[in-house]
Interface confidence: low
């Protein structure tokens, strides 16, 4: 059978507002007082098994004791009333759990959404944490009819159990209630049709146009509550490799539609599209994006001619010369399609032009020593580019006018070249470069720059610590001008090896040292200077610095009949490297001198 408790705590289920004061009382039963020979002064209050200080306790009468707590902050406290029976034995009389928290804040920011094909979901901001069990109930009604309440599981949202009825306004509000209070949000009044989030458009397809290489036509299917809603669209697109989307102006897609032509696109380019929709009034929510669809614009004729240059090979006879015409493949953005071939037309004054169709990017022809004009056009299936024209003068004509103040310097991992234009109008500039090496021929790469350019960077794959010979040639309507060259490094390093020093002549008190320049393959940069270190086996080391233009140096004030150790180092802007150590001995006597 159940044992009767010795007394009770009131209130039995205490809930206190944080920061406020709270008083509980413990009332002992008369039978208990007599059984244990106690009264209320024997009561010991405890919170979480710790005795409450006596100053918080008041004995009201022989059966009743109260305890007062100020500024309650703990979320949950076990409060027990205990008696000291027979002097020292502590008996538990009763226990309660005291909870603390806050009354609910008035819910704010109540918003609702109708995901197409689902019931309405409403969401709100509950305000500050209550720290208590708090029930949130979403209420909704028409002017004439109440809908079933929606009990929130999370306290911040609820999905109603009924299907929405469109084109009739509904009133919605949230009630929040816990042990400390009850509060209602402001109500919102709306037509559920203005809260719809449509399902994404589907079956998005993209087609191109043979007539216009700058457009793609889109078509799609919209749902809009099965045609109940008129939807406007939001269309975004990007090139296949891009990461950012381009926005079609929303004002262009405001009217309900299931197709659209996107303009101002680049020819022969793959684009990816996506589309979303919203009620045409702009009320409600945007749908999620559709699945992406891609399409490629039609080809257009190449937008510019290729870069065009020529090289003259050494001729064996006097009457003919071998000329190699060279050009660069157009980048995709300028080719505007698949380049099928190139058309080269060679014209010699007062003679019929010769036309060549070439699939590669060079053509070698044998020309007489007359002046020629070569033109080059790239062709795709739509048409030909404009022609690049190059005058090949007679070899007897001396090239005049070259660029001045030619400079090269590395910056941001690129090798930059700049110059001052010649005093005569230029058609274009040709930059040529190659790696200088004693072990391999100088294999040239080249690029073309417009007449307005006087600073550019080399666009090939350049290597660090390699010496590049760079040549700039202005090209005029009459043919190439004079060429200017310089050497440059993308990035210097310390030399791969130092100079090997030797003696050219040794006297009693001096020695002439000589060395060879470090091969260009080992220089790794511009050699700025040398250092010569020399010492005897017992003396201290001496160092002299020598300009990089020298290949010999005289050491003076040496001791006679002495072994010297010599080492040389070469320095670039990025550091130095020692060569091997060399030894020599000065003679005891000068030439013709007797002991």
């Amino acid at each position: 059978q159940l044992l009767e408790p010795c007394g009770y705590i009131y209130p039995e289920f205490p809930v206190v507002q944080r920061g406020s004061n709270f008083t509980a009382i413990c009332v002992l039963k008369e039978a208990c007082l007599q059984h244990y020979y106690v009264n209320a002064s024997y009561i010991v209050w405890k919170t979480n098994h710790a005795a409450v200080p006596r100053e918080q306790v008041t004995v009201i009468n022989r059966t009743t004791s109260s305890v007062t707590f100020t500024d309650v902050v703990l979320p949950s406290v076990q409060l027990t009333c205990n008696i000291l029976s027979f002097g020292q034995i502590e008996q538990n009389v009763y226990g309660v759990t005291m909870l603390s928290g806050f009354p609910p804040d008035k819910p704010t920011n109540l918003t609702c959404i109708v995901n197409e094909g689902k019931n309405m979901l409403c969401q709100w901001d509950p305000g500050r944490e209550t720290y208590l069990e708090t029930n949130y109930t979403l209420k909704s009604e028409w002017a004439t009819e109440k809908f079933p309440d929606c009990q929130s599981k999370h306290g911040t949202s609820c999905m109603v159990s009924y299907m929405p009825t469109y084109y009739v306004n509904i009133e919605v509000w949230v009630e929040a209630e816990n042990a400390l209070g009850k509060v209602s949000s402001e109500s919102i009044n709306f037509d559920p049709v203005d809260k719809v989030k449509p399902t994404p458009p589907y079956n998005l397809s993209v087609t191109n146009s043979e007539e216009l290489s700058s457009i793609l036509k889109l078509s799609w299917v919209s749902s809009g509550l099965g045609g109940l809603l008129d939807l406007k669209s939001d269309i975004q697109y990007r090139t296949k490799d891009a990461s950012t989307w381009i926005q079609v102006p929303l004002e262009d897609t405001m009217s309900p539609r299931t197709s659209f032509t996107v303009q101002d696109l680049k020819p022969f380019t793959e684009y990816v599209f996506r589309i979303r929709s919203i009620k045409d009034s702009g009320k409600g929510y945007w749908s999620d994006w559709s699945e992406e669809a891609s399409g490629t614009t039609y080809e257009d004729r190449p937008s510019r001619p290729p870069s065009f240059w020529y090289k003259t090979n050494p001729s064996h006879g006097q009457e003919y010369r071998s000329v190699r015409l060279i050009w660069k493949a157009l980048p995709l953005s300028e080719a505007n399609g698949k380049i099928l071939d190139y058309e080269v037309i060679l014209t010699q004054s007062k003679s019929v032009s010769q036309t060549y169709t070439v699939t590669g990017t060079e053509l070698t022809v044998n020309l007489t020593n007359d002046r020629y004009v070569a033109s080059l056009a790239a062709r795709n299936k739509v048409g030909k580019s404009a022609a690049a024209v190059l005058t090949i003068p007679s070899p007897h004509v001396t090239a005049a006018y070259s660029v001045v103040n030619l400079k090269a310097f590395p910056k941001d991992n690129l090798l930059w070249v700049e110059w001052t234009p010649p005093p005569k109008p230029v058609s274009k500039y040709i930059l040529e470069w190659c790696v200088l090496s004693e072990n391999a021929p100088c294999v040239e790469d080249w690029q073309q720059e417009d007449a307005t350019v006087n600073r550019t960077h080399l666009r090939g794959r350049l290597l660090e610590s390699k010496c590049y010979q760079i040549t700039v040639t202005p090209v005029f309507a009459t043919g190439p001008g004079g060429s200017e060259s310089l050497k440059a490094y993308l990035k210097q390093a310390a030399p791969a090896r130092g100079p090997t020093v030797r003696t050219k002549k040794v006297g009693k008190n001096e020695a002439v040292l000589a060395w060879d320049q470090i091969p260009v393959d080992d220089q790794n940069g511009f050699i700025r200077n040398y250092s010569i270190s020399y010492r005897t086996s017992v003396g201290k080391e001496m160092v002299v610095h020598v300009d990089s233009s020298h290949t010999e140096y005289t050491l003076s004030s040496l001791s006679s009949d002495t072994l010297y150790m010599v080492r040389m180092a070469a320095y670039t802007d990025e550091g130095g490297k020692d060569g091997p150590e060399f030894t020599f001995t000065t003679p005891k006597f000068a030439q013709g001198e007797i002991e």
Epitope: L121, W124, D125
Partner: nanobody, 125 residues
């Protein structure tokens, strides 16, 4: 009880960077989506960025897209916000906010509160 403690704010010049942290306790951090919000002087709360419980999906306000990066370390119960290319209009008190589910629905915008003390970010030359 839920506790959120922001840190990492400070004074920085335009174009500079900061990394804000939010240490969370009192709940199962890895189960909830989290957001960063901010309040500029004299203005209302503005939502900045959100991340789902697993960290696989992130969301940004247009005003910070491409400059701010949200991330989380569920093992350390910590939320982060990396602020790059800061502008004077980014000056605000930044707070982190806990959502009530693991997923964040960007089509639903509702009120946020700063439960923690926040951390002040001042962008000035």
């Amino acid at each position: 009880q839920v506790q959120l403690q922001e840190s990492g704010g400070g004074l920085v010049q335009p174009g500079g960077s900061l990394r804000l942290s939010c240490a969370a306790s009192g709940f199962t951090f890895s189960s909830y989506a989290m957001s960063w919000v901010r309040q500029a002087p004299g203005k209302g709360l503005e939502w900045v960025s959100a991340i789902n419980s697993g960290g696989g999906s992130t969301y940004y306000a247009d005003s910070v897209k491409g400059r701010f990066t949200i991330s989380r370390d569920n093992a350390k119960n910590t939320l982060y916000l990396q602020l790059n290319s800061l502008k004077t209009e980014d000056t605000a008190m930044y707070c982190c906010a806990k959502h009530v589910t693991g997923d964040y629905d960007p089509s639903l915008r509702y009120g946020y509160n700063c439960w923690g003390p926040g951390t002040q970010v001042t962008v000035s030359s």
